[in-house]
Every structure is written in C-alpha cells, then in structure tokens.
C-alpha cells in the first residue's frame, strides 16, 4: 500500500497545504476569545473554556474530542481573609503593610475573579522575625551567606528576588537554611527592561505588579496525593503531612513597589558584591535585621491559603493515522492561566487551535495523517503540570509503546527576537531542516530563511553555521512525557534577545497585566511571530506523523553524548588526587558513548539502503528510532528523584526550568568536596558512572541489527 | 598515536611569569575539553584549569583566579597556562590531561616541573 494511504494530496503538496492554512489572522482572534477573563485552574470559567475548546476542535474536524477529569490538590487564596506581609514596631503594630492586589489594567477594572498574588501551595502561617536578604535564593546564594559571610538563615525571614532559577527551588534552599518564612518580589534590575515603558504604555512591570506561581518541589510527581497514580475517582489519596513536594514555611510574592519599603531598611553585612545589588535605590544589605534606628522593627506574613481536592480537565482530540493508527504524535499546552494569560498559555494555545483547524481543514478534503495525532488543552499546569501528568499517569501503558514525539506548545512568545528551541537530539535535524523552508518573519531578513535569521542571532556555540539548540528542562508539560516516560519531546516559541535583555523571563509574566493588548500593541502587532511559532510547532507535528521514517537522526545522539560525557569528566577532574585514590574511572562510559557513536553510524548506514516498500521492515527501523528515547529511561529513577527517569537528561537539582546532563553523576559529584564521608560520595560516583555507561551501552543495542 | 608533550617548565622567582605548552598529536585536539593539574613535591594531585572546545570558555582552582591564563591555538594543536605573578605554592610537576576520540581512557602528558624559589 502507499504510505500516503487515504488520501488523494501528494506528500509535499500536503505540508504546503498545511501550512498555507495557517493564518496570523485567526491566531489572534483565537488569542482574544480566550483572554478577556481569567481562566484559573479548578474553577468554572475554565471549565467553560475546556467545553468551548472541544466542541470547537469537534467542529474543525477531529475524529473524537473528549474531557478527561481528574481530582487534584490546588491552593487558594482565602476570600475573605487576605495574603500580606507587615513591618510591625516593637509594640506589634501594624506600621507598613503590602498591597492586597494588583492595581487592574485599564479596561480590565470590572473584571471579577482576578485571584491576587499568592504562592500556590504556601502553607499558612504568621511568622514574625528578622529579615534576611538572601540574593536570588540560589543554592550557590546561600553558600555564600552560609560559608563565606556566616550568616545564619535559622529562624529568620528570606526575601529574594525573583529571577535566574525556578521558585521552588528557591524555597526548596530557604527551607534548607531553616527560614520561617520566604517573601519573593521582582526587582527591576530583572523585570523592567531600561528604556522600556511600563505597562500599559509598554511591556515592562510595574511597581505593583507582582509574579504569582507555585512553589512546589514535585521533582515530576504530578498531583502531590497520588504520586505515580492518575487522580481519578477511585484513587487512594496521601494525607496532606505525606503530600509530595509541599513546602513547609509561608511563602508571599510581592512588588518592588513593597520590596522597596522593606529593603531600604535593611541592615547587618553589606551586599558581598554587585552581583547582589538590583536597581532599587537601597542598599542591599543582607542584614539579618535593619538598620539602628530601625532595629526594634520586625517582618510578620499573614498567609492564610488553602489546599484544596478539586477538579480539573484536560481536553483531548485525536485525528487518527491512515496506516499506523497505533503510532501517537501528541502536540499538548495548557490552558489554565494566572489571570488573563495574554502570553502564558494562551499565546500557545490560541497556535495549537489554529494548527487543529488547519489539520481538520485538510481531514475535510480527504487526507488523514500517516499517523495518529493527539491535541491537547491540558489544565492545572501552573500549579504543577498537573493536568497533562495525570493524563500520562493514566494512559502510560499505551504512551510507552506507542508514543512517537510530544511537542509542547505553551506560551508561542517570550520576546520578537529570534526562535528559541529546546528538544531531543533525535529532533536536531528535523528542525534544521523544517526552519530552512520556512520564511523569517524578522526585519531585515526578507525573503531569508528563518533558519538563515535564527542561526545569525542565536548562532551554535560548538559549531558554526548551525543556531542554538538547548537540552530540555522542565517547568512545562512535556515533563512528563520526556523525563518519566522517554517519549522524545521539543519545543519552540519566539525569544528575546538574551545578550541585551538581562531580565527574567518576560517583565509582566504571572502578572495581572499579561493581557490580549500587551501582545497586539507591544510583542506582535502583525501576529506574524506567533504565525511562525505555529509553522515551526505545526510542521513538527506533520512531518512526524506523515513522514514514511521517523525523521530522528540518532547520529546527533551521539554527537551530544560525547560532548556531555567530556563536560562531566571535566568537572570530575577538579578532583584529581581524589579520583586516583577512589579509582574513579570514566573509561566505561567513554567506551559506551564510542560504541554507540559506531552503532549509530551503522544504523543510519542501514537507514538509507532497506527497502522501504517493506511494511514490516519499514515499522521495525521506525520502531527502533521510536525506542531509542525510551532506551535512556531507568526504570528506578534517579536518586531521591523516581520520576525522572531519563538518564541523559533531568531538570537540575539547583533549577527545575534547566536540563542537566548525565544528572546522576553531576548531582554525586555537585559540592563533593564537603561530603562528611568521602569514601561513600566517591563511591556514589563509581556507581552513577556504572548507571549512565551501562545505560549508554543498552541505548547502543537497541539499534544494533536486531538478529 | 595519541600524546601530549608539556614544556615551558623552570625555575622562576617569586613574582615572575612563566608560560606552559601542551602540544597535542594524534586527536582532533579541537573537538575536546583539555585540563592542567598539578602536583606539588610530596603532595596529591590538584586540578588547576580547564578550558573547553572553542576555548570559549574555562575555569579555575581558586587559588590561581586572575594569576593564570589557560588558552589553547586549535590550529596549532597547542595548549598553553600563562602563570603570572607566581607564588613558592605553585611550584609543582604540572600535565596537560585530555581525552581523545580515539582513546578511552585520558591521555596525560609527562608533566613539566616549575620550581618557583627565591
């Protein structure tokens, strides 16, 4: 049979039908239905919204657009007892407190339902102490507190800025140092870009604005009560002391404008160096304490949020292969918003709707996909990529064995620069390849590639010519997909310039001021950037379920694995005397990686010459590119971590929105020098080096031939 | 075959620089992370620098943070450190330490000793 089985559109006539669809115009119609309220998770406007989302993905033209419901924790803010973070006098009264929102946008006054900044999951709480200002809360913040400054973080309050790693971890390091409580607040010097405007009259925050998010350490679990499980009706619930993940300390996010009044007081030790300065006009000072006059005054939080067992949906629509209807090549992104979600998701999701209306535009006409394709609306993703994990919980026996490729689609834009993408090396060269057809939207680079614009402004740093393409982290839905179950997973959206924007993110990420304006006056009037996201996203997923091979090249596998294994090694290295006198040998997983560079060579050798008329022989070298990813997944997790899996690839320890390679052996050997038992640490290395060479070499047999 | 041959190596005064080579053969010397450890007389071992690839980027032992430079001429296949204001602590055997796709096991140099003494 032709592999292009139930249709009457030619192979290429049929990416270019695709893509043509594809219309900046209905981006941003889509973007401006799904932004005019909020859409929180567990509540019934989103709710209304993942109803809305299926009965149109229904008209489009999929075969089958279900809801599928799950009972999770979330956390609240209570109603009718508010969030705020006081300075009280010595006699405990109230002499400064925090806003109890933020100052609506214009147009947005009569909005109900805005919930106010809250760290999701924050247990309550009144502490009261001294302050203790603590950097970005890093664990490399808090060695420099603890062993260089010997300043002791026991029983006092941290505030840290916001900014270079995820908001759990900062926690996760405040809690270590054994703080009471933790304010976070956004500082200019990485939330408001100079020469910028703040909104609305530009994209940069306000002194009111505040960065609302959860604080959980999951460290992949999904929802904390049913670690491993879905979340459905049957499910045996943690009690909430056994929850994984939840912090134990009060937690309250706040603006500058607030930040100010308790930083200028600040006393004890100067800031260690400029690297600890922001552009607040304060000193910095770490304290513990403030300043003389001031030193009687103490910092009290008043939390009062709750957690929660509610329900949430995710939406799923299917449009279902003509010739392997069992293979699944899922496109996912979230749907639950902060508040508004002009950028984060509903930039991303109003792409994915546009991508199904163009997918069931060509369904219409005939053509059906080679493969099966999955869409989904996920929900609860801000408080823990809760939705799209229990969905993989539920379905995991059938996404191991079938699961071709997740792309994640949340936010399209996080800037107008250039493209950023994060995936598997499998995917290196299907998206060199796809962005070379695709036109650059950027100025200046008419009638040029987007590769071509992409390469110039976000150039390789190991080989030239090629753009830069990062390991995957996490802190998005492809989570689950990549690190727990092995299914090779990417991502891609519109960047800023990172070498001029030092800030964080997005300015206004979180914030109430994240509206359908800031995009379509500030980001991407044209929507031609979101147009491009959707190109790049969209032709992914079509040339993964229609093209006859997997377009996987495992040979960029090897590439990576060679570069990983020479970082790690490096790093081992600072330790010399050390790994003489443990025995600390890299050989084996040198001798894996060399093994699996030559396998891979042959199997792509193979690759080119087998007779692709053959359906069996056809399905089994798609089988084993297929696998490949799932090879690199340890069936006993990492150390402390079961659900991250992948051995190549985990979210770092330090930073869940990074990816660290080889993380078994980096975590063994992070901070090793002040190990108490040395023996045992090395030894933890030896066998983390064990784990990843015997690992490296299974991956290398599972292309070998197969008899 | 695969080596690396330091030299540079000598006795200095307190105060003076020297300049280290490391000539790589046998590898694609550009495609790989190179290190310099030392080893002072009756001491272990201790790493003092590594550079990576494109030489781009590196790192080093605190101790001889703003003192020592590591650069490498991928052309050349050479790998140097240049020690400034050198100290009777740094005096040490030093090698150059690297892997080669070729080798699995690291490759060291035979070390150049640098006695640094008034």
């Known amino acids: 049979k032709s592999s292009n089985e139930a249709t009457n559109i030619t192979p290429k006539h049929n990416m270019k039908a695709f893509l043509d669809e594809l219309k900046a115009e209905n981006i941003k119609k889509f973007l401006y239905n799904f932004t005019q309220i909020p859409h929180l998770a567990g509540t019934e406007q989103n709710f209304q919204l993942a109803k809305q989302i299926q009965s149109q993905w229904k008209e489009f033209g999929l075969d089958s657009v279900e809801l599928a419901h799950y009972d999770v924790l979330l956390s609240y803010p209570n109603k009718t007892h508010p969030n705020y973070i006081s300075i009280i006098n010595e006699d405990g009264n109230e002499i400064f407190n925090t806003s109890l929102f933020e100052p609506p946008p214009p147009g947005y006054e009569n909005v109900s339902d805005i919930v106010p900044p809250f760290s999701a999951f924050s247990p309550q709480g009144m502490p009261e102490g001294d302050l203790v200002y603590v950097n970005y809360a890093r664990t490399e913040d808090f060695f420099k507190l603890e062993r260089d400054m010997k300043i002791n973080c026991s029983g006092k309050i941290v505030i840290a800025r916001y900014g270079k790693v995820f908001r759990g971890n900062k926690v996760k390091n405040a809690q270590l140092a054994g703080a009471k409580g933790v304010i976070l607040y956004s500082d200019p010097a990485d939330y408001f870009a100079p020469g910028v405007k703040s909104y609305p009259d530009g994209w940069n925050l306000p002194g009111g604005g505040v960065q609302r998010g959860n604080i959980l350490n999951l460290n992949g679990a999904g929802d904390p009560l049913t670690p491993g499980y879905p979340a459905n009706e049957y499910a045996y619930r943690r009690g909430i002391a056994e929850a994984v993940g939840l912090p134990s300390i009060p937690v309250h996010p706040i603006g500058y404008y607030d930040a100010q009044k308790l930083l200028e007081k600040m006393g004890g030790s100067a800031p260690p160096d400029s690297s600890w300065r922001g552009s607040l006009k304060v000193p910095y000072n770490v304290g513990p304490g403030f300043t003389g006059n001031f030193s009687t005054q103490k910092v009290k939080m008043h939390i009062h949020s709750t957690n929660e067992v509610t329900r949430i949906y995710n939406v799923i629509g299917t449009l279902r292969g003509a010739v392997e209807p069992d293979r699944y090549v899922i496109l996912g992104g979230h749907r639950d918003s902060w508040v508004f979600g002009g950028i984060d998701p509903q930039s991303g999701a109003a792409v994915v709707h546009e991508i199904v209306r163009s997918f069931g535009t060509l369904k219409k006409e005939g053509w059906r996909p080679r493969r099966t394709i999955l869409f989904a609306s996920w929900d609860a993703e801000e408080f823990g990529l809760l939705g799209s994990t229990e969905w993989a919980e539920e379905n995991s026996r059938l996404l191991q064995e079938r699961g071709v490729a997740y792309i994640n689609a949340d936010s399209s834009i996080e800037g107008n620069y250039t493209l950023r993408v994060d995936c598997t090396p499998l995917m290196y060269s299907l998206v060199h390849n796809l962005t070379k057809e695709l036109k650059s939207p950027d100025e200046g680079f008419e009638g040029k590639s987007l590769y071509e614009s992409w390469t110039k402004k976000s150039p390789s740093p190991e080989f030239s010519g090629m753009p830069r393409i990062s390991k995957l982290g996490s802190g998005n839905d492809f989570e689950v997909f990549f690190q727990r179950l092995g299914i090779a997973s990417g991502r891609a959206r519109y960047t800023k310039n990172w070498e001029t924007n030092k800030f964080s993110g997005y300015p206004l990420y979180h914030s109430v001021y994240e509206t359908y304006e800031l995009v379509e006056k500030f980001y991407d009037p044209m929507f031609k950037y979101h147009l491009t996201v959707a190109q790049v996203r969209g032709g992914m997923v079509f040339e993964l379920a229609n093209s006859i091979v997997l377009p996987f090249d495992c040979r960029d596998y090897a590439v990576v694995l060679r570069k990983y294994a020479d970082k790690i090694y490096s790093i081992s290295m600072k330790h010399p005397q050390e790994m003489k006198t443990y025995s600390v040998s890299f050989d084996s997983l040198f001798s894996a990686v060399k093994n699996f560079t030559e396998i891979a060579s042959k199997f792509s050798e193979r690759l080119q010459d087998f007779d692709k008329s053959n359906p069996i022989v056809l399905r089994m070298m798609n089988d084993q590119l297929m696998f490949l990813e799932r090879a690199f997944i340890d069936p006993l997790g990492l150390p402390d971590r079961p659900f991250y899996r992948h051995v190549i690839y985990a979210p770092s320890s330090h930073n869940k929105y990074a990816g660290e390679s080889f993380p078994g052996i980096y975590d063994a050997l992070f901070d090793i020098e002040s190990k108490v038992d040395p023996s045992k640490a090395w030894g933890e290395v030896k066998r983390q080096i064990y784990v990843a060479a015997f690992t490296v070499q299974a991956a290398a047999e599972t292309l070998s031939e197969v008899a | 075959e695969v080596q690396l041959v330091e030299s540079g190596g000598g006795m200095v005064q307190p105060g003076r620089s020297l300049r280290l080579s490391c000539a790589a053969s046998?590898?694609?010397?550009?495609?790989?992370?190179m290190h310099w450890i030392r080893q002072a007389p009756g001491k272990g071992l201790e790493w003092v620098a590594t550079?990576?690839?494109?030489?781009?980027?590196?790192e080093y032992v605190d101790s001889v943070k703003g003192r020592f430079a590591v650069s490498r001429d991928n052309a050349k296949n050479t790998l140097y450190l240049q020690m400034d204001s050198l100290r009777a602590e740094d005096t040490a055997t030093y090698y150059c330490?690297?892997?080669?796709?070729?080798?699995?096991?690291?490759?060291w140099g035979l070390g150049t000793l640098v006695t640094v003494s008034s």
């Open positions: 330490v690297g892997r080669a796709s070729a080798s699995i096991t690291p490759v």
């Open positions: 046998g590898f694609t010397f550009s495609s790989y992370a």
């Open positions: 550079i990576y690839q494109d030489g781009s980027e590196s």
